[in-house]
């Protein structure tokens, strides 16, 4: 089976790499525009230059193209704790990231939020905090992991998953409760 190609891909595949087919005349291959520029006018004929113009401030193209407009620069989302790592240039989009001792949590492919790395209080660091992953903690005896924090087993209720880790303490609490009944 032949894979289905979009119209643009079909048109481009007729021309050699770095060129695209003229939209009004499919016998002409025009040179694509360099990154940092966009297509202002198609080349008038074979071997003639494509009219490419530099992207205006606030816009970019990151690869060779025949786009009629540059792409708008991304803005870092302050409400998500994001900070600007590098500003937008004509050939590169803004790069957003997190502050030191924070990690990115991706809610979706193109949306991340910055959170503080866990310190593993009442536990030890099993895996250090990374750019896209929180610290992995191992809790000391008498503590269990809840929302990546080591919480005292005295906060473990029988209905929760912590009962296996906190079994001796749970039995203790149960015994105390039983002895208090009449």
């Amino acid at each position: 089976l032949v894979p289905h190609l979009g119209d643009r891909e079909k048109r481009d595949s007729v021309c050699p790499q770095g060129k695209y087919i003229h939209p009004q005349n499919n016998s002409i291959c025009c040179t694509k525009c360099h990154k940092g520029t966009y297509l202002y006018n198609d080349c008038p004929g074979p071997g003639q230059d494509t009219d490419c113009r530099e992207c205006e401030s606030g816009s970019f193209t990151a690869s060779e193209n025949h786009l009629r407009h540059c792409l708008s620069c991304s803005k870092c989302r302050k409400e998500m704790g994001q900070v600007e790592i590098s500003s937008c240039t004509v050939d590169r989009d803004t790069v957003c990231g997190c502050r030191k001792n924070q990690y990115r949590h991706y809610w979706s492919e193109n949306l991340f939020q910055c959170f503080n790395c866990s310190l593993c209080l009442n536990g030890t660091v099993h895996l250090s905090c990374q750019e896209k992953q929180n610290t992995v903690c191992t809790c000391h005896a008498g503590f269990f992991l809840r929302e990546n924090e080591c919480v005292s087993c005295s906060n473990c209720k029988k209905s929760l998953e912590c009962t296996k880790l906190c079994l001796p303490q749970i039995e203790n609490v149960k015994g105390t409760e039983d002895s208090g009944t009449t």
């Epitope: 989302r77 302050k78 409400e79 998500m80 959170f115 929180n134 929302e147 990546n148």
Partner: nanobody, 119 residues
Framework: EVQLMESGGGLIQPGGSLRLSCAAS????????MVWVRQAPGKGLEWVSH????????YYADSVKGRFTISRDNSKNTLYLQMNSLRAEDTAVYYC????????????RGQGTLVTVSS
């Protein structure tokens, strides 16, 4: 105590519109970025949209961009989601929530309102 109460869901035909509301109490609503998330049957939570404290910065998932509009009225402590051109794939329970602060989980979210898009 933080309370979030969604309303406005229901059965709607494809192409139709609905407006969801979320009444907030127990915290300073005007100080919080607010979020709409949804959960389709048998699926995980999907981030739909969010709006910053003053209603200036908004975000929309690609799947709803151009069809849904998030807004808020800080004087009424209410968050809204205007849903137009509804599709079968928008069928889900919609929840409003405060933007998480401590980690990637929702400490405060409502009980949800069911939106069913079907002919």
């Amino acid at each position: 105590e933080v309370q979030l109460m969604e309303s406005g869901g229901g059965l709607i035909q494809p192409g139709g519109s609905l407006r969801l509301s979320c009444a907030a109490s127990g915290f300073t609503f005007a100080h919080e970025t607010m979020v709409w998330v949804r959960q389709a049957p048998g699926k995980g939570l999907e981030w739909v949209s969010h709006i910053d404290r003053v209603g200036q910065d908004t975000y929309y998932a690609d799947s709803v961009k151009g069809r849904f509009t998030i807004s808020r009225d800080n004087s009424k402590n209410t968050l809204y989601l205007q849903m137009n051109s509804l599709r079968a794939e928008d069928t889900a329970v919609y929840y409003c929530a405060e933007l998480p602060k401590r980690g990637p989980w929702f400490d405060h979210r409502g009980q949800g309102t069911l939106v069913t898009v079907s002919s």
